[in-house]
Interface confidence: medium
């Protein structure tokens, strides 16, 4: 259903409008394949506003309908290696509560060093987002070439 | 912080909602790296609503967060041609006020004729956007292939 | 020109907010290259606030611009296939009315087996968006890898 | 147009070995899997093997697996089965068919030779 | 190995009328990528087989859209909506899904 009260004057606060852009820290120990992500004007240009950091992985603050982005670049790479080492792949996904475990977003790179994507779908407060990265090549952790990040869309 | 004034009626200009959306004018001369862009109804479905364009490049009016997004197709391209003039990259970024440059989103060809990226970052009034193409392959100007754009998302 | 009415109140409701975000559900017959959605909560994270689904086809039913995005996956696909199979061509673009009917978004898939992309369009109430995939590979069905969707974005 | 020619079949006696050729022309070979299916005399369709389009990857029907060698030499057009340690439950039309091209051995046979005829037999 | 089963073995008709057969894998031939990896070939008496259905529901180039295929995980079925004599000869299933690659036995369509 549409909107129960749409004449209802609507308070700055419910916008919602909760929003992260994350840049790369590192990348996890063998065997964890999660990226560890780190936000805040202190380190450039990414920032928190309603999500939060929780060891690196996103957590979600407001029940919605979120754009989920996100930019991988490898590090060391051409497309020959790219292909040769192929599949290396990201996937996107809420990694916790395990309840709603579930890949939201995957992406191989092929013969391509670089993968970027984008899309909707409804998040709630306590989601967790995990972004795994699977293969033997490393990501870039240039501000301008990797980069995750949310943005609340609707209730 | 989050919203000082929360329970604040909200204003429809309050919202922002600056967008724009431009198609490919014409690359630079020699030594120019930068795509020059162009938009208005009268092209076509591109469009500015609040930034401006000053000498084929997009002037930010309003202090926010914004979501940037371009794609970038290589007129004249295989998989051959792409990989045989690499690296052919493209690169968003903050040009001018000089204070203020700096990349924001970087994306190389590789073996593909096609990028395409967003990020959510902060744009303050009075940024000029550039985008640059290096390498030796011209991108097509086709307005379903090639095209830039902002939208505002939040203050 | 801006907004008229600067410092009216802002209804919930006006905001529009239409939102909508689709899975696949199968090709076309022969010598249809259009992808046929679906979405709704019984299916998993797909969902229709607003716009609605016609024969499979995406329904616009407000005025606006709008944020089109769309992943597509190649189901069985190796960059060696892909560039073998090449051209396979993903196209976005408004297939009905007649009159308004435009190709918004394009790209090839050369050596790669994902394409994603997303961009700006003004759309008005009653365009309906097809998805043309062109070339002789299938598409993933995966919701992670294959799927489509809008955002109202500003009037 | 696509074709697809077998060769080499014959008549020969169990434990002996034979090489089959399948010459391929109207497409780009060497972008393309291939395989081996054969037919018994009166019974139906078997699959014996298929190579990817570089040779990079075989794979083998159990009934063959350390006896038959599926080969391609891209630079010629040609495919190849060495059958080696022949039995009479080898007796076939033997038909080389174009992978679908999908990728390397996940589609369809969508073209196929006119077979060659193997008899194993004393 | 995975092991395909096809009913019935022979099946008479008559043209202009509808005809289907039944294929039957030992476990699912549903690829994680959406698809069922199940194809169907013809062979027509005295010729090498043709390509008729792959994945399941797709007709390969220049097969007629009288031919049908449906189906998911471990059911199919092959489907002429109206039979004509050039359709006689055996109708073969395979599992495309993972090597060895497997027939089923064949059904033969013969007209009335």
């Known amino acids: 259903q549409r909107f129960a009260q749409a004449q209802q004057q609507l308070p700055l606060e419910s916008l919602g409008w909760d929003v992260a852009e994350l840049q790369l820290n590192h990348t996890g120990p063998q065997q964890d394949p999660r990226l560890y992500w780190q936000g805040g004007p202190a380190l450039g240009r990414s920032f928190l506003h309603g999500p939060e950091l929780d060891k690196g992985q996103l957590r979600i603050h407001r029940d919605g309908i979120y754009m989920v982005h996100i930019q991988v670049t490898l590090a060391i790479c051409s497309s020959t290696t790219a292909s040769r080492h192929h599949p290396t792949t990201l996937a996107v996904g809420i990694c916790s509560p395990a309840s709603r475990s579930i890949s939201l977003l995957r992406l191989s790179f092929h013969q391509g060093c670089t993968i970027a994507s984008q899309r909707l779908t409804p998040l709630a407060r306590g989601d967790t987002l995990c972004t795994n990265l699977t293969g033997t090549l490393l990501p870039s952790r240039n501000t301008d070439e990797t980069f995750f990040g949310v943005q609340w869309v609707r209730p | 912080q989050r919203f000082a004034q929360a329970q604040q009626q909200l204003p429809l200009e309050s919202l922002g909602w600056d967008v724009a959306e431009l198609q490919l004018n014409h690359t630079g001369p020699q030594q120019d790296p930068r795509l020059y862009w162009q938009g208005g109804p009268a092209l076509g479905r591109s469009f500015l609503h609040g930034p401006e364009l000053d000498k084929g490049q997009l002037r930010i009016h309003r202090d926010g967060i914004y979501m940037v997004h371009i794609q970038v197709t290589l007129a004249i391209c295989s998989s051959t041609t792409a990989s045989r003039h690499h690296p052919t990259t493209l690169a968003v970024g903050i040009c001018s006020p000089a204070s203020r440059s700096i990349s924001l989103l970087r994306l190389s060809f590789h073996q593909g004729c096609t990028i395409a990226s967003q990020r959510l970052t902060p744009l303050a009034r009075g940024d000029t956007l550039c985008t640059n193409l290096t390498g030796t392959l011209l991108p097509s100007r086709n307005t379903d292939e090639t095209f830039f754009g902002v939208q505002w998302v939040r203050p | 020109q801006r907004f008229a009415q600067a410092q009216q109140q802002l209804p919930l409701e006006s905001l529009g907010w239409d939102v909508a975000e689709l899975q696949l559900n199968h090709t076309g017959p022969q010598q249809d290259p259009r992808l046929y959605w679906q979405g709704g909560p019984a299916l998993g994270r797909s969902f229709l606030h607003g716009p609605e689904l016609d024969k499979g086809q995406l329904r616009i039913h407000r005025d606006g611009i709008y944020m089109v995005h769309i992943q597509v996956t190649l189901a069985i696909c190796s960059s060696t296939t892909a560039s073998r199979h090449h051209p396979t061509t993903l196209a976005v673009g408004i297939c009905s009315p007649a009159s308004r009917s435009i190709s918004l978004l394009r790209l090839s898939f050369h050596q790669g087996c994902t394409i994603a992309s997303q961009r700006l369009t003004p759309l008005a109430r009653g365009d309906t968006l097809c998805t043309n995939l062109t070339g002789t590979l299938l598409p993933s069905r995966n919701t992670d890898e294959t799927f489509f969707g809008v955002q109202w974005v500003r009037p | 147009q696509v074709q697809l020619v077998e060769s080499g079949g014959g008549v020969v006696q169990p434990g002996r070995s034979l090489r089959l050729s399948c010459a391929a022309s109207g497409f780009t070979f060497s972008s393309y899997g291939m395989h081996w299916v054969r037919q018994a005399p009166g019974k139906g369709l078997e699959w014996v093997a298929v190579?990817?389009?570089?040779?990079?990857?075989?794979y083998y029907a159990d009934s063959v697996k350390g006896r038959f060698t599926i080969s391609r030499d891209n630079s010629k057009n040609t495919l190849y089965l060495q059958m080696n340690s022949l039995r009479a439950e080898d007796t076939a039309v033997y038909y080389c068919?174009?992978?679908?091209?999908?990728?390397?051995?996940?589609?369809?046979?969508?073209?196929w030779g006119q077979g060659t005829l193997v008899t194993v037999s004393s | 190995d995975i092991v395909m089963t096809q009913s019935p073995l022979s099946l008479p008709v008559t043209p202009g009328e509808p005809a289907s057969i039944s294929c039957r894998s030992s476990?699912?031939?549903?690829?994680?990528?959406?698809?069922?990896?199940l194809d169907w070939y013809l062979q027509k008496p005295g010729q090498s087989p043709q390509f008729l259905i792959y994945?399941?529901?797709y007709r390969a180039s220049g097969v007629p859209d009288r031919f049908s295929g449906s189906g998911s995980g471990t059911d199919f079925t092959l489907r002429i909506s109206r039979v004509e004599a050039e359709d006689v000869g055996v109708y073969y299933c395979i599992n495309s899904l993972q090597t060895p690659f497997t027939f089923g036995p064949g059904t033969k369509v013969d007209i009335k």
């Open positions: 190579i990817w389009y570089d040779g990079s990857n075989k």
């Open positions: 476990q699912s031939l549903l690829n994680s990528n959406g698809y069922n990896y």
């Open positions: 068919a174009r992978d679908g091209g999908y990728s390397g051995y996940d589609s369809g046979f969508d073209y």
């Open positions: 994945l399941g529901s």
